[in-house]
Interface confidence: low
């Protein structure tokens, strides 16, 4: 069937359209195009005779039409009046006619739209604004965008006039946005420039900052006021109702108690004509004096004296606070506060009570601290320590002993040998000693302030022969795979080499064995039962050597998984069942039995005479080592056949 296709169907003014013919019959004489839906000679556009290939314009020919041999018609430079139907009349060779009609629509290319507004400065919660998209264009669709988004759903937004007009009722400050309109028709779409809606609002109730309402005499008062407003608000300050200045900030230096009162900020919007005020009450407090601490005893003696610290000056209706070592007071029966907290008493002072101590006076604004006070606690002397710790020396070396005792004031020292006073020094030095220098060396420490005196006595042996050493241990019963043991070879002797043997052999190489303290200490990490050996230490110098008696390490271990013997699991009825359980363990474990889960006796051997098939079941041996806290068990199945 003969058909006409319009390409495109919607044509923009000034463009071109092709009326494309489909299913053109064979054996044609010619064809003609007509404007309209029927063949009308008055409205013929063009005719075409195939034989002569001659095209003849008709009355409706505008000069913009071109006919093709395949009967298609091209119309150029389209105008609005070209809209409508076009009919093709085909004349076949047998003079039988055929007709087909096609159509297209012409639309203008849209101009860039613009937005007009009926109110350039609407007031919040009062005015409405109507935006209109210009120009008005026939057959155009109107769209609106807010901040480049499609219109939100809102009862305050209304479209009218074929969507050409957007009305915002009762505008708010949140309607301050970018508005655009768009026009569309089948051949074009154009968007307007943005229009920013400038909503007048405010002022809101102003906020005064900072929020602080209490000040101390002598400080500066600096208040700032802010109110949300468009255009920005104009500000005025009033103090106790009296106008001060028209600024956003109010600054009063070096305030006094007289500056206390009500401070009002007024915000004014000249466009909306609205005023809002906020009031804050400022209180200025007088500056209290800086506190200080007095003490009833400036040099208390440890464990004897008490000290009373008092916070000055005395002020009525004031809270007193105390700190020790920059911390609040610890709970201690030796610390007592008076009823008004003004006096802190330290009962039976110790050297740790030196402080520093601070007191504070609390007012409405802050706490004023005193300067810190440190107590000079007299103590000691403690028992003096004599160093070095060596007790054995070889003849010919120099003996240099030093004494120290904790004391305040520092102790005075005296040395005695075998009870005879030697010198009043902290150090004692004797060169090139001999066996005759062996004896009791006493250090005496004296505290002149407390009158106390303490002594320490050390036995010094000068001998070419080393003493027989001994081994001390930090753990006499270590647990396997858990504990470490440190053996130390005593005594500590000067210029001495320390040696170790295990079961008569030199130390094996093992990451679990470590020598330290000049080889004087042997540490066994993560002991095992194999470490239960005889350990011997030896000391030697250039002239002598000696060995300790052996110390055997008692390693607690187990219990290991027990073994039930005999291994038989099948018995004849009437036989005796005699099961023995054994588990490697130190100390020996406690044994118990269960038959089919039921507890039996606490023995290593389980004996049942003349067993029957009723004795079939599971026989479990449980072992427990109370020293290691570990348990173990094994289960054996017994079958008795009739």
């Amino acid at each position: 069937k003969l058909t006409i296709e319009s390409t495109p169907f919607n044509v923009a003014e000034g463009k071109e359209v092709l009326l494309l013919v489909h299913n053109l019959p064979q054996h044609l004489f010619g064809y003609s195009w007509y404007k309209g839906e029927r063949v009308d000679g008055n409205r013929q556009i063009i005719g075409y005779v195939i034989g002569t290939q001659q095209a003849t314009p008709g009355p409706a020919y505008s000069g913009r039409e071109i006919i093709y041999p395949n009967a298609s018609l091209l119309i150029q430079n389209i105008i609005q009046n070209d809209t409508g139907f076009y009919t093709l009349h085909v004349i076949k060779s047998d003079l039988v006619n055929e007709e087909a009609t096609g159509q297209f629509r012409v639309y203008p290319e849209l101009p860039k739209p613009s937005i007009s507004s009926n109110n350039s400065k609407p007031v919040e919660d009062k005015d409405a604004v109507a935006f209109t998209c210009e120009p008005e264009t026939q057959d155009a669709t109107y769209l609106w965008w807010v901040n480049n988004q499609s219109l939100p759903v809102s009862p305050r937004l209304q479209l009218s006039n074929g969507n050409r007009t957007l009305t915002l009722f009762n505008v708010t400050r949140n309607d301050t946005a970018s508005y655009k309109c768009e026009t569309q028709n089948p051949v074009s779409a154009r968007r307007s420039d943005s229009v920013i809606l400038n909503v007048l609002y405010g002022p809101d109730a102003p906020t005064i900052s900072p929020l602080n309402t209490s000040y101390r005499s002598g400080e500066n008062l600096n208040l700032s006021c802010h109110a949300a407003s468009n255009p920005p608000a104009q500000y005025s300050w009033f103090v106790n109702g009296t106008f001060q200045q028209s600024t956003q900030e109010l600054f009063i230096p070096n305030i006094t108690v007289n500056n206390s009162g009500s401070y009002t900020c007024q915000a004014h919007n000249s466009d909306t004509g609205l005023n809002r005020t906020t009031v804050t009450t400022i209180t200025v407090y007088a500056e209290p004096p800086k506190p200080f601490i007095t003490s009833n005893n400036s040099n208390p003696v440890e464990d004897e004296d008490a000290v009373a610290l008092t916070c000055e000056p005395e002020i009525q209706n004031t809270t007193y606070l105390w700190w020790v070592n920059n911390q609040s007071l610890p709970v201690s029966p030796r610390l007592q506060l008076s009823n008004d907290n003004r006096t802190l008493t330290l009962l039976s002072v110790t050297r740790n009570d030196v402080g520093p101590y601070e007191c504070g006076i609390q007012n409405e604004l802050s706490v004023d601290h005193s300067d810190p006070v440190i107590l000079n606690v007299l103590y000691g002397p403690d028992d003096p320590t004599i160093s070095p710790s060596y007790t054995y020396y070889r003849p010919g070396v120099n003996l240099s002993l030093s004494c120290h005792a904790a004391s305040n004031p520092p102790a005075q020292y005296s040395w005695l040998i075998d009870g005879n006073i030697q010198q009043h020094t902290q150090e004692l030095f004797i060169s090139n000693i001999t066996e005759k220098n062996s004896g009791l060396y006493t250090c005496q420490a004296n505290n002149s302030a407390s009158g106390h005196s303490r002594t320490t006595v050390k036995t010094i042996t000068v001998s070419a022969e080393l003493p027989k050493p001994s081994i001390s241990s930090n753990n006499s019963k270590p647990v396997e795979d858990k504990d470490a043991v440190a053996f130390t070879c005593e005594p500590e002797a000067q210029n001495t080499t320390y040696l170790w043997w295990v079961n008569g052999q030199s130390l094996p190489v093992s990451p679990r064995l470590q020598l330290s303290n000049g080889n004087r200490t042997l540490t066994l990490f993560n002991v095992t039962r194999n470490d239960a050996r005889a350990y011997v230490c030896g000391i030697q110098n250039s002239v002598s050597a000696n060995r300790s008696d052996p110390v055997t390490l008692d390693v607690l271990y187990g219990p290991d998984t027990p073994i039930i013997s005999p291994p038989d699991s099948s018995y004849l009825s009437g036989a005796n069942l005699n099961l023995s359980c054994h588990s490697a363990s130190n100390p020996s474990p406690q044994y118990s039995w269960r038959i089919n889960g039921i507890p039996q006796q606490h023995t290593q051997v389980l004996f049942i005479a003349k067993i029957t098939p009723n004795n079939n079941g599971t026989y479990a041996c449980f072992v427990s080592n109370l020293a290691t806290g570990r348990n173990n068990s094994i289960v054996k199945s017994i079958t008795v056949s009739a």
Partner: antibody, heavy 120, light 105 residues
């Protein structure tokens, strides 16, 4: 923090002795621990060589024991490795490492490694 | 000698994947340690004594196991985890696994 730094020649001739030193900073060797050498041939895994303790106690990998000597110098806070009669198979990156123990022994601090090539 | 066998010898995984490496021993050991080695760098301790996280190591790394079978896991693979991972035990003397090379898909 504890740091280990290996040093020594990068090229050793076959049959000669390889000598490397590890300098410890941020920790005193004589305070304890064991001090190890580990090597890694090109493109291969890690092989433990041995360790020395500050007291001079040593323990070597059985496969290298006959050729390895380790020494410690607590005054310089250093320990060293000597590997004699080297061949091309001894070409590797050599690391020194500190051993820590939490009842179990592992290497918690390593040097950045030094490359040793055995070639004529 | 106790032999350590790691599997797989290499693996490729995506960021965010859970990655598991196993280490089998020729006889029973009481613990296992794990190290990470990035190209050209020294090994770094990640896990000690089977399951303890070394200081400063992210919590996505973990370890478990006992006897002869031990496992090392990265719960959510990160790009910076590209490295070779070694298991390590110390019985008579220290030995290491042959290593597992981890790559990002």
């Amino acid at each position: 923090q504890v740091q280990l730094q290996e040093s020594g020649p990068g090229l050793v001739r076959p049959s000669q002795t390889l000598s490397l030193t590890c300098t410890v900073s941020g920790f005193t060797i004589s305070s304890g621990y064991s001090w190890h050498w580990v090597r890694q041939p090109p493109g291969r895994g890690l092989e433990w060589i041995g360790y020395i303790q500050y007291s001079g106690i040593t323990n070597y990998n059985p496969s290298l024991k006959s050729r390895v000597t380790m020494l410690v110098d607590t005054s310089k806070n250093q320990f060293s490795l000597r590997l004699s009669s080297v061949t091309a198979a001894d070409t590797a990156v050599y690391y020194c490492a500190r051993e820590d123990y939490d009842y179990h022994w592992y290497f918690d601090v390593w040097g950045q490694g030094t490359t040793v090539t055995v070639s004529s | 000698d106790i032999q350590l066998t790691q599997s797989p010898s290499s693996l490729s995984a995506s960021v965010g994947d859970r990655v598991t490496i196993t280490c089998s021993t020729s006889s029973s050991v009481s613990y296992m340690h794990w190290y990470q080695q990035k190209p050209g760098k020294a090994p770094k301790l990640l896990i000690y004594s089977t399951s303890n996280l070394a200081s400063g190591v992210p919590s996505r790394f973990s370890g478990s196991g006992s006897g002869t079978d031990f496992t090392f896991t990265i719960s959510s693979l990160q790009p910076e985890d590209i490295a070779t991972y070694y298991c390590h035990q110390w019985s008579s003397y220290p030995t290491f696994g042959q290593g597992t090379k981890l790559e990002i898909k």
